[in-house]
Interface confidence: low
Amino acid sequence: WPPPGTGDVVVQAPTQVPGFLGDSVTLPCYLQVPNMEVTHVSQLTWARHGESGSMAVFHQTQGPSYSESKRLEFVAARLGAELRNASLRMFGLRVEDEGNYTCLFVTFPQGSRSVDIWLRVLAKPQNTAEVQKVQLTGEPVPMARCVSTGGRPPAQITWHSDLGGMPNTSQVPGFLSGTVTVTSLWILVPSSQVDGKNVTCKVEHESFEKPQLLTVNLTVYYPPEVSISGYDNNWYLGQNEATLTCDARSNPEPTGYNWSTTMGPLPPFAVAQGAQLLIRPVDKPINTTLICNVTNALGARQAELTVQVKEGPPSEHSGISRN
């Protein structure tokens, strides 16, 4: 209890202070003295919980002394001045510095007053996300990879996607002692529908103001998926030329288109122009099955279309496009 007639003095400090690995940090600590109160501070002391002896002392006549003089410094205390600010700066923060510290004022006539501060040592992680290029496997494989390197505490990684998929996360010690590298794989059964779609890796960490979002554009390599368009079942004799298109989706891109029929090579009225097939006017009915064969680096696939050119008045029908 303070002696009769004295108001109490209070030590003010935050309960927790964050600092970054390798950086410097100030542990703030102030003595709040009521108006008209006579208070004499003879010594400022900092000690770490669980360790004997003081790490930093500032004496009213002898000045400062430190357990590690290159790493500690009273930021405001000066000989000959009133000792009201015990704030201590720590340089080159290490993992081992994390812990509870006591800031203590030795005062007269009130006695000793102290407060505890928790120093939390953080390391801001570096985050990267990359695609894992895959082929059609028929089973779940990692399709994207998100890495948060050198965080303390470890970052939390989650994935956002409307494609389904499953996260698989692992941790290893980081390059700097006390840090952690978190790797998260996003796993899904590859399909052509997934190729070119995006997934987002979200990384959360105490040192971030808001979560970091990293977008990965998925790559699935697959052989061509082929269809033929441009035929509407209404082609008649005497109409002008028409065009069929061989529509192919593939990754990588198609390297070649080859048109043929079930009977062998193309008939004279059909002229191949890459992905397109020009159908010239004919003077007798036709019933032919056309084949488009598309090749890419992973293989070849084909589509078939049976085309009929029928007798009948072209004026009454939509058909081969007119000029």
Partner: antibody, heavy 115, light 107 residues
């Protein structure tokens, strides 16, 4: 201060459906997944699933697929869980929580399914 | 699904004691484990994440350790307000799974 306000206790008949709500206050609703957890004396804590309110993306525990449907309304910062074709097995306390870096859970909604 | 086997189910203790609760995962979950405390009639409250990191405001008598498949929550110098049920939970893979719980009671 983060707060999660869950809807009040429900007493419902078997075979019906119920929609529980969870209003989030004090943080950016669209930044964090909202998870739902079931608690019973027999099975303890069971994770039902999660929704990311920003994108609407969901993930479910296979056990609760077809039973629970998760939705979120960004304008009111409210997450919902609808439970269908209720049986006595669905009687439990249901919690919502953003989990991960946040410690906060709702106060829980007690659901009783009984004739 | 990953099973989290928690032991013991019940534990009797006295104020000032040191107690440990263990959780064994059925497969490697790195350090992706959270420990929760749940007092009677209340919601669970997270104490530890990433196996060993205390949430701010959690007293330092609560310590988490372990990685891979074996995890421990230790309470040194048990206080009366620590009497509660404790759960572990893995978040390495969906579905997230919890341990069955350990009830801490007074002798």
């Amino acid at each position: 201060e983060v707060q999660l306000q869950q809807s009040g206790a429900e007493l419902v008949r078997p075979g019906t459906s119920v929609k529980l709500s969870c209003k989030a206050l004090g943080y950016t609703f669209t930044d964090h997944e909202m998870h739902w957890v079931k608690q019973t004396p027999v099975h303890g804590l069971e994770w039902i699933g999660t929704i990311h309110p920003g994108s609407g993306v969901t993930a479910y525990n296979q056990k609760f697929k077809g039973k629970a449907t998760l939705t979120a309304d960004k304008s009111s910062s409210t997450a919902y869980m609808e439970l269908s074709t209720l049986t006595s097995e669905d009687s439990a306390v249901y919690y919502c929580t953003p989990l991960w870096l946040r410690r906060d859970w709702g106060q829980g909604t007690t659901l009783t399914v009984s004739t | 699904d990953i099973q989290m086997t928690q032991t013991p189910k019940f534990m009797s203790t006295s104020v000032g004691d040191r107690v440990s609760v263990t959780c064994k995962a059925s497969q490697n979950v790195a350090t992706n484990v959270v420990w929760f405390q749940q007092k009677s009639g209340q919601s669970p409250k997270a104490l530890i994440y990433s196996a060993s990191y205390r949430y701010s405001g959690v007293p330092d008598r609560f310590t988490g350790s372990g990685s891979g498949t074996d995890f421990t929550l230790t309470i040194s110098n048990v206080q009366s307000e620590d009497l509660a049920e404790y759960f572990c939970q893995q978040y390495n893979n969906y579905p997230l799974t919890f341990g069955a719980g350990t009830k801490l009671e007074l002798k």
